[in-house]
Interface confidence: low
């Protein structure tokens, strides 16, 4: 049988049209694979749901910045 190739890639085909409160976001990852039709950001919420978002939208950029700062701040 033919082999699978490399690792799985997740794609986003549409984006949420609702701004998600930053308090509800736990993490994010960027989707930049050439095998996907759109660059995207996938937010993981505090209840572990993943949602596709448009990286060009300001609220998405702000949310990523906020999460980056949270990660950089040591938890005591």
């Amino acid at each position: 049988q033919p082999d699978a190739i490399n690792a799985p890639v997740t794609c986003c085909y549409n984006f949420t049209n609702r701004k998600i409160s930053v308090q509800r976001l736990a993490s994010y990852r960027r989707i930049t694979s050439s095998k996907c039709p759109k660059e995207a950001v996938i937010f993981k919420t505090i209840v572990a749901k993943e949602i596709c978002a448009d990286p060009k939208q300001k609220w998405v950029q702000d949310s990523m910045d906020h999460l980056d700062k949270q990660t950089q701040t040591p938890k005591t």
Epitope: A4, I5, N6, P8, V9, T10, C12, Y13, S34, I42
Partner: antibody, heavy 127, light 110 residues
């Protein structure tokens, strides 16, 4: 519909190009043109796909890299070039449309299935 | 490699009976699984995708289920027209649009 052509009886070591012509099939951003083969009395084996959209990106099964080349030659035509053929390449070669399914707005794994197939073209490699 | 193992290789069932075909992946494929039916001299026909969604025009006697590494297609009230070879296909590789097929299961209807 999809229709393959170019199947033939060839000698080991020869090269051959197969063509798939599509008619009346919608090729959106989320579809691929693919080749799958089936040796006589055996199972299905995926060979390669090409993005039917503008990118024309190509993808191969690891065993097919190097000896097989898939190309989108027009918006409705795809070819499969095969080199250094051996008896093990004797098979019916099917052209198929790979379609992606997804749920908005959640991330999708670009789930695919082959939802449309041609009748196949027979390639026989024998001396 | 996400290898797919299909069982049984062959099954015989009388008209009206129930046929169950299993497909096991070497690692989790997260429901990225399709099923095909192929009759002699014909190309395969898509039956089920996303593990459990019936393709257009497929009779409701076909049912797909499963998760993780184990998946099943069940044909309830099997008919003579269901005699064919059935293949599973995973699409959890690379960009998740490329796959491996199972080895196939021949269904004989008595």
């Amino acid at each position: 519909s999809l229709e393959e052509s170019g199947g033939d009886l060839v000698k080991p070591g020869a090269s051959l190009t197969l063509t798939c012509k599509a008619s009346g099939i919608d090729f959106s951003l989320y579809s691929y043109m693919c080749w799958v083969r089936q040796a006589p009395g055996k199972g299905l084996e995926w060979i390669a796909c090409v993005d039917a959209g503008a990118s024309g990106s190509t993808y191969y099964a690891s065993w097919a890299k190097g000896r097989f080349t898939i190309s989108k030659t027009s918006s409705t035509t795809v070819t499969l070039q095969m080199t250094s053929l051996t008896a093990a390449d004797t098979a019916t070669y099917f052209c198929a449309r790979g379609i992606l399914y997804y749920t908005w707005p959640y991330p999708a794994g670009a789930i695919d299935a082959f939802d449309s197939w041609g009748p196949g073209t027979l390639v026989t490699v024998s001396s | 490699a996400y290898d797919m193992t299909q069982t049984p290789a062959s099954v015989s069932e009388p008209v009206g009976g129930t046929v169950t075909i299993k497909c096991q992946a070497s690692e989790s494929i997260s429901n990225y699984l399709s099923w095909y039916q192929q009759k002699p001299g014909q190309p395969p026909k898509l039956l089920i995708y996303k593990a459990s969604t019936l393709a257009s025009g497929v009779p409701s006697r076909f049912k797909g289920s499963g998760s993780g590494t184990e998946y099943t297609v069940t044909i309830s009230g099997v008919q003579s027209d269901d005699a064919a070879t059935y293949y599973c296909q995973q699409s959890y590789s690379s960009s998740n649009v490329f796959n491996t097929f199972g080895g196939g299961t021949e269904v004989v209807v008595k």
